[in-house]
């Protein structure tokens, strides 16, 4: 099942995946793909990275947080209607079948055409239940042991609506996490 | 603490090649990538090109790619930057440096003191 | 390679002033931008990086903001020692690349 986030048509919508760098500079290229995450590599790419940098990317699509700490959260800028669906972010662990994929769900809901309050929201974020390591609130942690070396932990958050800024802070705290290392 | 020694200024005949070395010290140096970054006489700072220590993985600026070779040599923790086929419009300070995260993510910035090259027939 | 538009490219201002200088990236950088300053003859010394944070050492009058693909450097009081030219610099996709400069001069 995906995590889902919703936006509005026009607005920018924000897909959280995380994971945490063994070490500082030890970048895990990462790609994002339109759809739901294949065996291998991402089907649809829309951005990559690599061990250093951001390496490929088409239009509206970039990365807004500090990729080099790990957040590998996607931004696309100014969505239509058509940017709904699957979107996979799979972060490429080395080794064979060491791959974390995330599928998150992206619903686009048509403009509202009354005035617009004074907080505008960006996003909103639904799912019934997480799994975090963060400190916000009730967490659980799994250790797959098929993975050699690696902790993995899912993040997201428990939100219908963002209905104050502070929430809307902490979304950038939701998403996909991994531990390599 | 951190030093970055440069060579010393060159003087070079167009088409020849010149070999900039940059001494690290006081850091892990296989940890960081070292950045080649050259300025022209009254000019901006351009990006050349970069390699990581620990396994010789180099990217070059498409600009160069043809005509630049970065290399290092981890037991003497120095980078070498060789540009070929001289030009006069390669006159400039040449500098390496460089950056990164580093322990508890704090940002890791070093410049060495730069050479300059002049090429001049 | 992604462009970045640097203004001004020289700006004169008295002791004291606040002085503004303005990055525009060709393509969204995130908060992948950085700022340096340099002084004739010496080698660029970085003061802020990731957008807004300040680097070990640099006083608190040096602060940057932005974030997408407008940046801003502000020096919220000019001081004699910060007649130098400021250069930004993305640091999100290679090759990276910087702004064309500013100078920054004393009336």
């Known amino acids: 099942s995906e995590v889902e986030y919703r936006a509005e048509v026009g607005q920018n919508a924000y897909l959280p995946c995380f994971y945490t760098p063994a070490a500082p500079g030890n970048l895990v290229p990462v790609c994002w793909g339109k759809g739901a995450c294949p065996v291998f590599e991402c089907g649809n790419v829309v951005l990559r990275t690599d061990e250093r940098d951001v390496n490929y990317w088409t239009s509206r699509y970039w990365l807004n947080g500090d990729f080099r700490k790990g957040d590998v959260s996607l931004t696309i800028e100014n969505v239509t209607l058509a940017d709904s669906g699957i979107y996979c972010c799979r972060i490429q662990i080395p080794g064979i079948m060491n791959d974390e994929k995330f599928n998150l769900k992206l619903v686009i809901k048509p403009a509202k055409v009354t005035p617009a309050p004074t907080r505008q929201r960006d996003f909103t974020a639904a799912f019934p239940r997480m799994l975090t390591t963060r400190g916000h609130g009730p967490a659980e942690t799994q250790t797959l042991g098929s993975l050699p070396d690696i902790n993995l932990t899912q993040i997201s958050t428990l939100a219908n609506e963002l209905r104050d800024s502070r929430l809307a802070n902490d979304l950038r705290d939701s998403g996909a996490t991994i531990r390599i290392g | 603490q951190v030093q970055l020694v440069q060579s010393g200024a060159e003087v070079k005949k167009p088409g020849a090649s010149v070999k900039v070395s940059c001494k690290a010290s006081g850091y892990t140096f296989t940890d960081y990538y070292m950045n080649w970054v050259r300025q022209a006489p009254g000019q901006g700072l351009e990006w050349i090109g970069d390699?990581?220590?620990?396994?010789?993985?180099?990217k070059y600026n498409q600009k160069f790619k043809d005509r630049v070779t970065m290399t290092t040599d981890t037991s003497t923790s120095t980078a070498y930057m060789e540009l070929r086929s001289l030009r006069s419009d390669d006159t400039a300070v040449y500098y390496c440096?460089?950056?990164?995260?580093?322990?508890?993510?704090?940002?890791?910035?070093?410049w060495g003191q730069g050479t300059l090259v002049t090429v001049s027939s | 390679d992604i462009q970045m538009t640097q203004s001004p490219s020289s700006l004169s201002a008295s002791v004291g002033d606040r002085v503004t200088i303005t990055c525009l990236a060709s393509?969204?950088?995130?908060?992948?931008l950085a700022w340096y300053q340099q002084k004739p003859g010496k080698a660029p010394k970085l003061l802020i990086y990731?957008?807004?944070s300040l680097a070990d050492g640099v006083p608190s009058r040096f602060s940057g903001s932005g974030s997408g693909t407008d940046f801003t450097f502000t020096i919220s009081s000019l001081q004699p020692e910060d007649i130098a030219t400021y250069y930004c610099?993305?640091?999100?996709?290679?090759?990276?690349?910087f702004g064309g400069g500013t100078k920054v001069e004393i009336k």
């Open positions: 393509q969204p950088i995130g908060i992948w």
């Open positions: 390699i990581i220590p620990n396994n010789g993985g180099s």
């Open positions: 610099q993305q640091l999100y996709s290679s090759p990276w690349t």
């Open positions: 440096a460089t950056w990164g995260y580093g322990s508890s993510y704090r940002w890791f910035d070093y």
């Open positions: 990731a957008a807004t």
